[in-house]
């Protein structure tokens, strides 16, 4: 806490300008009017204040706005944003996407800080849902943003927002998240033709059920192995050798390189060895010829 001292004669700040960098902390406290600072916040960023001086300026704003800063001030915080705590940010009501962008720009190139996470949370909650423009903005600054949300939070993403998602935005998503996103993507892209649809839906296929994979296998999509390896094991297991061959097209020979990784390994164990042999890839581990396969799950369903 800076001690309250009178401003020396002739030092009262008429405006926020570079002369203030020569003020000591106590002089800034005594000579800069908080209301003036609030109206000229856009100038602060252009002035090379020290971290200690910025602390004083923050303190003045905190005194002026104990219930939280207005958006007109927040939008122009610039580097002063880095001085804010999550507790400060929780008091704010940020509704403008421009304000959000301005603050994200300050943190650009860094990991998502607790301050930024709090800011985004406040903004999204204020909007009620993750609309396309917001998602566009957030993934531009933080490609992993989408995958940092819980499945519950993702359920508030409207299908229309899915158009903003790029493949790299889904790189760190786990299967539970893709389970939520896939049906939204399917809905968003439903009016596209076969090949265009596949290009768009490909990144979301880690949440696709068996019947959708079977449907894709009829469309000459030539899925690559990187995508196939991300599919849900339970969705891949029921596929026949012929369906996998159609699904992968020329990439089918890649199964050999991945035969010990899931889901390929588990799928191989479910296939008849003579069916696997038809691929000519040297895949081993299928059900030996002459063995009877009992589908116990089907038996339980019938009983």
């Amino acid at each position: 806490e800076v001690e309250k001292t009178a401003c020396p004669s002739g030092k009262k700040a008429r405006e926020i300008d570079e002369s203030l960098i020569f003020y000591k902390k106590w002089e800034l406290e005594a000579c800069v009017d908080a209301a003036l600072l609030a109206t000229q916040m856009d100038r602060v960023n252009a002035i090379p204040f020290t971290y200690e001086q910025l602390d004083v300026l923050k303190h003045k704003l905190d005194e002026l706005y104990p219930q939280g800063y207005p958006e007109s001030v927040i939008q122009h915080l610039g580097y002063l944003f880095l001085k804010m705590s999550p507790e400060d940010i929780r008091k704010w009501n940020v509704t403008s996407l421009e304000t959000l962008k301005a603050l994200l720009e300050v943190n650009k190139g860094h990991e998502m800080s607790p301050q930024v996470a709090t800011l985004i949370d406040r903004f999204v909650k204020g909007r009620g849902q993750l609309d396309k423009d917001t998602l566009d903005t957030l993934t531009a600054f933080y490609p992993g943003y989408l995958c940092s949300l819980s499945p519950e939070e993702l359920s508030s993403v409207p299908p229309s927002s899915i158009w903003a998602v790029r493949p790299q935005d889904l790189d760190t998503c786990d299967p539970r998240q893709l389970d939520v996103l896939y049906p939204k993507a399917r809905l968003a892209f439903q009016n596209m033709n076969g090949s265009e649809y596949f290009v768009k839906i490909q990144s979301f296929l880690g949440g696709a059920p068996t019947e959708d994979l079977k449907a894709l296998s009829q469309q000459n999509v030539s899925m690559d192995l990187a995508t196939f390896m991300k599919l849900r094991t339970d969705a891949v297991l029921p596929l026949t050798v012929a369906e996998v061959q159609k699904l992968l097209g020329p990439h089918v020979e890649g199964l050999k390189a991945e035969e010990r990784h899931r889901p390929v390994r588990d799928w191989i164990l479910r296939q008849r060895q003579d069916d696997l042999d038809t691929l000519g890839l040297g895949l081993q581990g299928g059900i030996p010829n002459g063995y009877l396969v009992l589908d116990l799950s089907m038996q339980e369903a019938l009983s």
């Epitope: 790299q168 690559d224 990187a226 991300k230 990439h251 991945e258 010990r260 040297g282």
Partner: antibody
Framework: EVQLVQSGAEVKKPGASVKVSCKAS????????MDWVRQAPGQGLEWMGD????????IYNQKFNGRVTMTEDKSASTVYMELSSLRSEDTAVYYC????????????WGQGTTVTVSS | EIVLTQSPDFQSVTPKEKVTITCSAS???????LSWYQQKPDQSPKLLIY???NLASGVPSRFSGSGSGTDFTLTINSLEAEDAATYYC?????????FGGGTKVEIK
Amino acid sequence: EVQLVQSGAEVKKPGASVKVSCKASGYTFTDYNMDWVRQAPGQGLEWMGDINPSTGGTIYNQKFNGRVTMTEDKSASTVYMELSSLRSEDTAVYYCARRRIGTGYFDVWGQGTTVTVSS
Amino acid sequence: EIVLTQSPDFQSVTPKEKVTITCSASSSVISSYLSWYQQKPDQSPKLLIYRTSNLASGVPSRFSGSGSGTDFTLTINSLEAEDAATYYCHQWSSFPYTFGGGTKVEIK
């Protein structure tokens, strides 16, 4: 430019563990498996195992009998190889090598990390 | 595991000469699953040939590969000084993946 940059040389005592990192850049990290290959002084190449950075799935050469663990950090585009219960025969240069998912050949290699095990 | 035996272990060759390195597998290897690597002293290995005969990107055309079943060959048609290195064959047809013992090529 595609690059695999490995952590620096290590000197360890027998029985200890070593963890080598391999940071990938210049390509889509999750489209390639990362394999680890080692080379003892004056010797040939020996495949240790691989990891799929997308799923975290691993395959290990049984020769390493539970001593090797491979992990990934997708957010940092980095994979790690930890070898435990070190013995003098583990003295080698350890390489990470990129392998496109669905192929079995290594098209880009790290610069290698020398691990010396000595009492 | 499949053992890959390379011969010769060492070869001293004059520039412009043809070099042939063989890689013999203890069990049959599907030809798509065999590759060759070049390693120069104090460097990491470099992919030379994949799928028995396909040249990797940037590899000069004097290198070629052939073979099937248990016998595979790497040929350097007209050796150049920069080709001094150790060459390894590698199979991923059968687990665990294995490399040959290497053939060191020296320039006379």
